[in-house]
Amino acid sequence: MASAGMQILGVVLTLLGWVNGLVSCALPMWKVTAFIGNSIVVAQVVWEGLWMSCVVQSTGQMQCKVYDSLLALPQDLQAARALCVIALLVALFGLLVYLAGAKCTTCVEEKDSKARLVLTSGIVFVISGVLTLIPVCWTAHAIIRDFYNPLVAEAQKRELGASLYLGWAASGLLLLGGGLLCCTCPSGGSQGPSHYMARYSTSAPAISRGPSEYPTKNYV
């Protein structure tokens, strides 16, 4: 039962991570206008994301602009976009692998194969978490570097946006959830009493984790 509980927790965490990652990736709040001292640097607040940028005027009016073209983007922005999408897709793949190996599914009958699939899904989620972490940390590094660069004008200095914090949370959840899934299946036949009971019970396994669990994928 403990193993099944950890699996459920792992999948819930990865699902939350995936949602966080998706929101982080989509929101144009990777970089936000910096505050220096007690006053805003400029009369307008700038939000910069992977897909668009928004300018919030002092009147409260917001204008968002989707980046003009896919190719006419700096390489670091293109890389962050790509890693974001890849991380989300990798997590979805991890979910599919997990569902195939979940105890409540009949895609795979053999218990050892199911355990291997759950372990694989955990590894995939961990990879997704790492992929999510890369663009977030890279962007944070660039923001901090520019913030302390004396040649960067005050109006161009940015602070860490909400999307970065969501990205870190997403990465953490994916890594934690994936790690839990890896830990629940050290080997195919070592599931102890719960495995024994499931093998000899005439009723459906008591621990059927909901197949609706999403693989959590992080954003970027």
Epitope: E48, V55, A72, P74
Partner: antibody, heavy 121, light 107 residues
Amino acid sequence: QVQLVQSGAEVKKPGASVKVSCKASGYTFTDYNMHWVRQAPGQSLEWIGYVNPNNGATSYNQKFKGRATMTVDKSTSTVYMELSSLRSEDTAVYNCARWDGYVYYYGLDYWGQGTLVTVSS
Amino acid sequence: DIQMTQSPSSLSASVGDRVTITCKASDHINNWLAWYQQKPGKVPKLLISGATSLETGVPSRFSGSGSGTDYTLTISSLQPEDVATYYCQQYGSTPYTFGGGTKLEIK
């Protein structure tokens, strides 16, 4: 509105120095870098360098390093560009221009009216 | 230093024509490119930044494109007021450099 007002035309002899001023108004002076660009008669634009008015940090085109000096007077919101060891090929219109932008949309959005510096013996 | 080569150096076109000016960088500039318009006796005016983004107030007949080392400024339908010299500027690395300019005239 944003305005950059430069000092008047100068005539200098070879080997002398010239100091051009650029007074900014209509925005927070210390928030935007100020660039200097020159244009010789009938020629293209040439980037000299820029200064961060907030802390005086500068970046120069290597071609002018050692000859160009950019300074800031925050009290009057004025940027200065001094060019020493003048030669005839330094005859040009010198412009200050404000650098602005975000994400990857950057450019010189406001320009001073230009200062003609003539170097002649 | 990154060299910016603009072509043609001058061109003459009729009102309503589609005009294309190209700018080639000697190295990859990651789309850090701006286009300026300079009318006779005036200071340059920023038209496009980030290779493709039209500045506020610039007529939509102007557009920018390109990537890597090759960039283009296009005027979809030439107007008499477009007579000027056009410059590209890279800001991917210092020193920021300008192209040699393209002088545009009306036939």
